[in-house]
Amino acid sequence: CEEPPTFEAMELIGKPKPYYEIGERVDYKCKKGYFYIPPLATHTICDRNHTWLPVSDDACYRETCPYIRDPLNGQAVPANGTYEFGYQMHFICNEGYYLIGEEILYCELKGSVAIWSGKPPICEKVLCTPPPKIKNGKHTFSEVEVFEYLDAVTYSCDPAPGPDPFSLIGESTIYCGDNSVWSRAAPECKVVKCRFPVVENGKQISGFGKKFYYKATVMFECDKGFYLDGSDTIVCDSNSTWDPPVPKCLKVLPPSSTKPPALSHSVSTSSTTKSPASSASGPRPTYKPPVSNYPGYPKPEEGILDSLD
């Protein structure tokens, strides 16, 4: 027989020879980090076919690291369902708790003993420090010094000293989240007032109000013979500007028409007549139909007010 087989978990006792005689036996022992559990054989014999009798290293088991309990308010999850060396242990905390320490421990061999690479972590309750104070506003539970997981606070704006109120920009409610961090940045309180939206050759058809503050929404339509260039609906954004910008109402120009050939007894001539507007400087907008009243929207005449005041 040629050299005996090699295994991951056991090694040959003594030095291997280049060849073995029929009937010759070789013995194995468990490698470092593995231990023998009877009754499986750990030897083989060169049989008369010049092959080694079947043998496996199933009798040698990996050293295992000590059992780790689940941390309080968390779980220890063996990566491959085993505590054997060379494998990992993952730690997860329950919702509302966060990990202090290593998230992964490795089962390592020290000498012939399998030990964990570090101390198991602990799961600590998620606690948040008070959320930020904001200028011109306040939040609920301002007297509380420590917030637990998912505790929420709601911001509101102070009354403004002038005629225009403070608007709350952003989400009013934030909560204590993972890693002891608030779910989002605090909102801000500031005066947001958009300029009065005027459209020449058109008019506002909804969103009427004394003044136009944050998120005020206005709709327009154009007079007969004009078409809307831009959006018919605009919203006052946090920078005190209309988004999209205030539209324009542009004059509807008839398309240039070509006269049919003039007929006579002898000569036929054709000429192209330009629309008077086509000689004006600058690009001429393509024909668009005028914007009519929008069905379903109140007309100003109907006296339906959507006051934003």
């Epitope: 300029r195 459209v199 506002q204 009427f208 004394k210 003044k211 100003p300 005449e301 007010l305």
Partner: antibody
Amino acid sequence: QVQLQQSGPELVKPGASVKLSCKASGYTFTNYDINWVKQRPGQGLEWIGWIYPRDGSFKYNEKFKGKATLTVDTSSSTAYMDLHSLTSEDSAVFFCAVSEDGYPWFPYWGQGTLVTVSA
Amino acid sequence: GIQMTQTTSSLSASLGDRVTISCSASQGISNYLNWYQQKPDGTVKLLIYYTSSLHSGVPSRFSGSGSGTDYSLTISNLEPEDIATYYCQQYIKLPFTFGSGTKLEIK
């Protein structure tokens, strides 16, 4: 407090031009729009147009396009209105008035400038 | 443009009276209406904006109301300094237009 000081009376010949001024004080000039309003003797008020000093944007009453030109000088907090090709129809008192954020109500008015067009 | 009509060009009332000045628009103006006072010396003041909002510093005896096309200015207790011409002004549509004015006199 907001004050608007307008230039003195003008006597001009037909066909000529005139430049009226309106000096603002008591507020940040670029924060308010300047409007101009015409009042013919014994008659009502007519809005000419407005100019927004912050960006120089303006809107005119179609009737006064070509007749009036609105400008501002932010360094001196002064608004100007040029009136062109004057006729007797342009004899009137011209007021400047401010409005905030383009809201078309005019809380502060100048004292008015009388323009008389006569040969 | 939108025509603003003040049908009463002049009005006589006694001190202490309640006076109402009316103004109508040629089409609905959705409360986009202001009132001004012009004194005999020519000085102009804003009294009321957006139909019923009192401008700061204006006495509370002045009030405004209305909707659609019809609007009014009321002086609840006429005082000598209220002698003036009163103008309404719409601003729903360019050009902004004024009424022809109502001259208020003391009986």
